[in-house]
Structure formats: structure tokens, C-alpha cells
């Protein structure tokens, strides 16, 4: 004969466990029904009656099959530096993530507890490692032959323009200024100029560039102090 299907509540066989979506009630010593996500146990089961479930109230939730007497409170509203990526419903908690331009400095089980603004690299420095959802930007000095004249969490160091004749040599925070109306050329197509290892030297001196971008000899001037970048921006 096929085994009879037991309806909750029922006493389990010795040594066996309750079925999926059931729990063992210690007081009643019976297997009883769990409540579905979005509900909670309003009345616990007895030997003769099953669990009575009720819907979660506003701003509360249960995400799993459960027998909790009260639903969990949804987290507080997202702060101004966050966006709500999952609303509070009867079946799920609110999830706050950092808004664009910010990263999560202190995470929690789901979402973010504390957001912080992405670091902005000041002139003379470029983004070496972009920010992610959970990590800050890392800035590095612009290598000789490159510059950044902005305060930015995204800008990398760009190569100096290459001049036929240099009016003002470039430095880490300012592009070269050419005397002719247009530069001969700038960087090789597709080249990426992240900050990179260079020999240990003062950045006030321009080393001989690699052959691929070798300019005219007039470019190979020592880089003395030069005026600040007009295009640089404050905070």
C-alpha cells in the first residue's frame, strides 16, 4: 500500500524530520506548516490546529519560509548619497547602493551601510585604478611626457602634444604649448596613458621620450617651473 500523506499538524516518526516548508514545534511536538515569504506566524500550531499565518505589515518583510511571530523591519530609507536598487516589499528588504561617483566604504549583508565619494585626482595626477562599487579610485603621478590639468575621478594622464617648436614645455599638470598653429601630432592612436613606472627622477626634468613619440630636439628642454594650468579646476 502507498504511504499515506500526513497533513499538518502531525507527529513525525521517531528519528525522522519534518518535510520541506514545515517545522517542528517543540511545544506541540508536531510538524507544522511554515508561513510563506511575505507572511509571519500569527498563531502557532497546536496538536489539533495548524499554524495561522498573516501578511506582513507595511515596512516589514519576511524573505524566507518561516514561523517568526513578527516580520522583520525594512532598513531605513536610503541616504542622499545612495539610490534604492530594491524597494521594501512584504517579501524583501530595501537595498541601498551608492549613487554614481560614490563607492561603498562599508558594506552590509545586502547593499551598502556607508558610501563615500570617489577620490578625485588633482592636477599632475591621473586615475591609475578606476573606482568600483566597493573600491576607491587610486591616483598616480603623471609620468614624464604626460599631464592632467583637471580634478577628476575618471581622467587619466594624457600625453603632451608634440610641437614643431615648443613655446612652453609641458609638465605633469600642463600640456606643452606650441608656437606653431598646430602640433605635429599627439599620441599614437589607441595608446593608453595610465601613470606608469619611470626611472626614479625628479618630474621637473623631461627624459628623452621613447622613439615612437620622439619629437623635434626643440622639445627636449629641461622643464623648469611653469605657470599653472588654466584649465585646472578646484573642488
Amino acid at each position: 500500500l502507498p504511504a499515506q500523506v500526513a497533513f499538518t499538524p502531525y507527529a513525525p516518526e521517531p528519528g525522522s524530520t519534518c518535510r520541506l516548508r514545515e517545522y517542528y514545534d517543540q511545544t506541540a511536538q508536531m510538524c507544522c506548516s511554515k508561513c510563506s515569504p511575505g507572511q509571519h506566524a500569527k498563531v502557532f500550531c497546536t496538536k489539533t490546529s495548524d499554524t495561522v499565518c498573516d501578511s506582513c505589515e507595511d515596512s516589514t518583510y519576511t524573505q524566507l519560509w518561516n514561523w517568526v511571530p513578527e516580520c522583520l523591519s525594512c532598513g531605513s530609507r536610503c541616504s542622499s548619497d545612495q539610490v534604492e536598487t530594491q524597494a521594501c516589499t512584504r517579501e524583501q528588504n530595501r537595498i541601498c547602493t551608492c549613487r554614481p561617483g560614490w563607492y561603498c566604504a562599508l558594506s552590509k549583508q545586502e547593499g551598502c551601510r556607508l558610501c563615500a565619494p570617489l577620490r578625485k585626482c588633482r592636477p599632475g595626477f591621473g586615475v591609475a585604478r578606476p573606482g568600483t562599487e566597493t573600491s576607491d579610485v587610486v591616483c598616480k603621478p603623471c609620468a614624464p611626457g604626460t599631464f592632467s590639468n583637471t580634478t577628476s575621478s575618471t581622467d587619466i594622464c594624457r600625453p603632451h602634444q608634440i610641437c614643431n617648436v615648443v613655446a612652453i614645455p609641458g609638465n605633469a599638470s600642463m600640456d606643452a604649448v606650441c608656437t606653431s598653429t598646430s602640433p605635429t601630432r599627439s599620441m599614437a592612436p589607441g595608446a593608453v596613458h595610465l601613470p606608469q613606472p619611470v626611472s626614479t627622477r625628479s618630474q621637473h626634468t623631461q627624459p628623452t621620450p621613447e622613439p615612437s613619440t620622439a619629437p623635434s630636439t626643440s622639445f627636449l628642454l629641461p622643464m623648469g617651473p611653469s605657470p599653472p594650468a588654466e584649465g585646472s579646476t578646484g573642488d
Epitope: 578625485k120 592636477p123 591609475a128 591616483c139 599638470s173 613606472p197 617651473p225 599653472p228 573642488d235
Partner: antibody, heavy 119, light 106 residues
Amino acid sequence: QVQLVQSGAEVKKPGASVKVSCKASGYTFTDYIIHWVRQAPGQGLEWMGWIDPDYGNTDYADKFKKRVTMTADTSISTAFMELSRLRSDDTAVYYCARDDASPLVMDAWGQGTLVTVSS
Amino acid sequence: DIQMTQSPSSLSASVGDRVTITCQGSQNIDNYLAWFQQKPGKAPKLLIYSTYSLQTGVPSRFSGSRSGTDFTLTISSLQPEDFATYFCFQYNNGYMFGGGTKLELK
């Protein structure tokens, strides 16, 4: 918490060299540049230069270019500043400070190392 | 090099006073100016960066402002622990400290 701990006081003779160390903890050493700043007794602060520990890039003040060498050992999160051909007017407290290259500058400093140059 | 002229070099004031210290740049430095406080035998401490931004943990009685190439540190109401030496520092084009202002108790 972020800490920069410098080596102890030094007494040197004119013409000698001194090497001061700055051990960093509480943050990712290679994500920040390290500045060196000195202060002669009763005087103001004087910027000497910086080093990027990640790549070893440096930028020195013109005044020190011929005599200073800044290095870093990332395996022990320590920056070094060596000043050669010491003179009596190099007697000063030497400080290291970290800088993340954002508008927030030199937000943590070492306690300082007194270097005395005397014959 | 950009020079930073800080004034006054010394200043006597009383607890509760409003105090201003000025730094003038020889060239445009955008907003890349910081203020440091230093007490005898101690390392400098960052108070303000980027002209206006208060460093975390610094009391709100400290504030920074700018008019052209003139930068000002204001202490709205002096407290006993504020008597120290203050330095401005430009970091837009190279790096340069001002000469310092020693703030003493009157």
C-alpha cells in the same frame, strides 16, 4: 588606524649622510605618495619632495635635487629619505606625510626625526 | 616657483576672540591651498584642504575662504587649545608652505 612611524634621532658630522625611515600602517602603502618636509629649529616648514612607493617616481624641490634620494620598500611599507653632504644648516626635524593625490593633502604625518649636524 | 606670503607672522589674542590669518599667492593656485596647525614638539595637523574643506574631526570654528589669490583661515571663537603656529600650503604648482603665524595668548 593610519600611522606613520619614523626612525629615531640622529647626530651626524658635516659631510656625512643620513637616512631617515618612515614605516606606514593602517592603509594601502602603494595607494599614496609620501612627502618629506623638514623644519629647522624655530623655523617654518620646508617641502623637500615626494616619492610614489608603487613605481619609485620622485619629485624633489630644486634646493635638494643634488643631495636627496627618496626610496621605498613596498615589502615592508617603508619610505626612506637620504640626505648627503650634510651641513650644519641641515639640522632639523624631518617629517614624512602621506598624500592620496586628491585635493585632500598630507592628512597623516610621522612624528618627526631630529637630525643634528655638528662637528 | 610660487611664493606664499603669510601674515601676520605673530598674533596675540584672547580666548573667545575671532582671528584671521592670511596667505597670498604670487600666482593663481586655484583652490589648492591647505592650512596646518602645529604645536611645539608635534607634527603639523591638517585643518583645511582645498581652500574650504574642513578635515574630518576638526572643529567647525575653523573655516577657510578665498578672494582671488588671497586665502584666509578664520577661527571664529578662540579656544585655549587653538594657541599654536599655523601654516598655509599651496599644492597646485609645486609645493610651498607659507612662513607661519604664531598665535599667542594675549
